[in-house]
């Protein structure tokens, strides 16, 4: 006699009997005999199980706290759970997305690289010379340096990675 | 490859008795669930009965409880029906079958032999 | 006993044609249900289990759905070898019982 000790894709072994797994959104009841398959009960509402499976319980859809910060970005299923994400300004804190912080800013002198979303924060960068920004933001990126040039005017005070350059009237040759 | 080859069958009175066997090749036959299933002329598929992979426990379809007895010898890879007090509603062909999966009376049958008959008249 | 109940009980089709078969079953049983195809004087032949899962070497053109009462297996296009009589199987619980048979034959 060879009892089982290895069962099929979607079977679980107990008591030497290869059993029948709950499929995705069903939890199980009670483990298969020689008489009966395996029992399962779809999960409730607000409950989800997500994979094949011989829980005896579903776990609950997350909860998405507004006084977290956090919104309903996909309503979960019986057999997916909640996904949040944060309101508009706030990302998450970790990819699980517990709770939100507020969008950070780029200081002046640097400017928004990647505009943040509900999951990433803001990425900001240094102004390149020639570049620059004189605000604390969240959207604005480094603007380049005015061309006194194309104004027909000179440049009187250079430009700084916060500060455009200040352009004027060219000198005049006296006659 | 994996054979079932049934014998056993013919001519029985009602009232008679006959064993049918099923010779089995090609798997490892100490590991499955085995049935027998039967097939009157022109009708549809009747479980009949099945057993454990090692012989330690059966279930048996009411319509043959307590008539008919399955039972195997895993050492020549054999399974058996031994068929009692048969009646003419008997009359069928009796295939065994290999359970698809490990445990249960229950499971889909995924391998057949090509069967045997029995017929039950006077 | 669990009854099966198969429809139609016989149908005709022609080749390249998409043909559907039902089976319900007296009660709930989840998704334990199993197809096979029978050809005359031949043995039945597994062909879908657990209501979907198609058994090792049976064509893609054969596929089952369904879950609780209601199962269906569907032959999206018909070839010459699939006209044969068809049944269904719930392996819920002993004993196993069979539907009375669906004969798909040649229009």
């Known amino acids: 006699p060879e009892p089982p000790t290895a069962c099929r894709e979607k079977q679980y072994l107990i008591n030497s009997q290869c059993c029948s797994l709950c499929q995705p959104g069903q939890k199980l009841v009670s483990d298969c005999t020689e008489f009966t398959e395996t029992e399962c009960l779809p999960c409730g509402e607000s409950e989800f199980l997500d994979t094949w499976n011989r829980e005896t319980h579903c776990h609950q859809h997350k909860y998405c706290d507004p006084n977290l910060g956090l919104r309903v970005q996909q309503k979960g299923t019986s057999e997916t759970d909640t996904i949040c994400t944060c309101e508009e300004g706030w990302h998450c804190t970790s990819e699980a997305c517990e709770s939100c912080v507020l969008h950070r800013s780029c200081s002046p002198g640097f400017g928004v690289k990647q505009i943040a979303t509900g999951v990433s924060d803001t990425i900001c960068e240094p102004c390149p010379v020639g570049f620059f920004s004189n605000v604390s933001s969240a959207f604005e990126k480094c603007h380049p340096w005015t061309s006194c040039e194309t104004k027909d005017l000179v440049v009187q005070q250079a430009g700084t990675n916060k500060t455009d350059v200040v352009c004027g009237p060219q000198d005049r040759l006296r006659a | 490859e994996v054979q079932l080859v049934e014998s056993g069958g013919g001519l029985v009175q009602p009232g008679g008795s006959l064993r049918l066997s099923c010779a089995a090749s090609g798997f490892n036959f100490g590991g499955y669930y085995m049935s027998w299933v039967r097939q009157a002329p022109g009708k549809g598929l009747e479980w009949v009965s099945a057993?454990?992979?090692?012989?330690?426990?059966?279930g048996y379809a009411d319509s043959v409880k307590g008539r008919f007895t399955i039972s195997r010898d895993n050492s020549k890879n054999t399974l058996y029906l031994q068929m009692n007090s048969l009646r003419a509603e008997d009359t069928a062909v009796y295939y065994c079958?290999?359970?698809?999966?490990?445990?249960?009376?229950?499971?889909?049958?995924?391998?057949w032999g090509q069967g045997t008959l029995v017929t039950v008249s006077s | 006993d669990i009854q099966m109940t198969q429809s139609p009980s016989s149908l005709s089709a022609s080749v390249g044609d998409r043909v559907t078969i039902t089976c319900r079953a007296s009660q709930g049983i989840s998704s334990y249900l199993a197809w096979y195809q029978q050809k005359p004087g031949k043995a039945p032949k597994l062909l879908i289990y657990a209501a979907s899962s198609l058994q090792s070497g049976v064509p893609s053109r054969f596929s089952g759905s369904g879950s609780g009462t209601d199962f269906t297996l569907t032959i999206s296009s018909l070839q010459p070898e699939d006209f044969a009589t068809y049944y269904c199987q719930q392996h819920y619980t002993t004993p196993p019982t069979f539907g009375q048979g669906t004969k798909v034959e040649i229009k």
């Open positions: 057993i454990k992979y090692d012989g330690g426990s059966t």
């Open positions: 079958a290999r359970a698809l999966y490990y445990t249960g009376f229950y499971r889909p049958l995924d391998y």
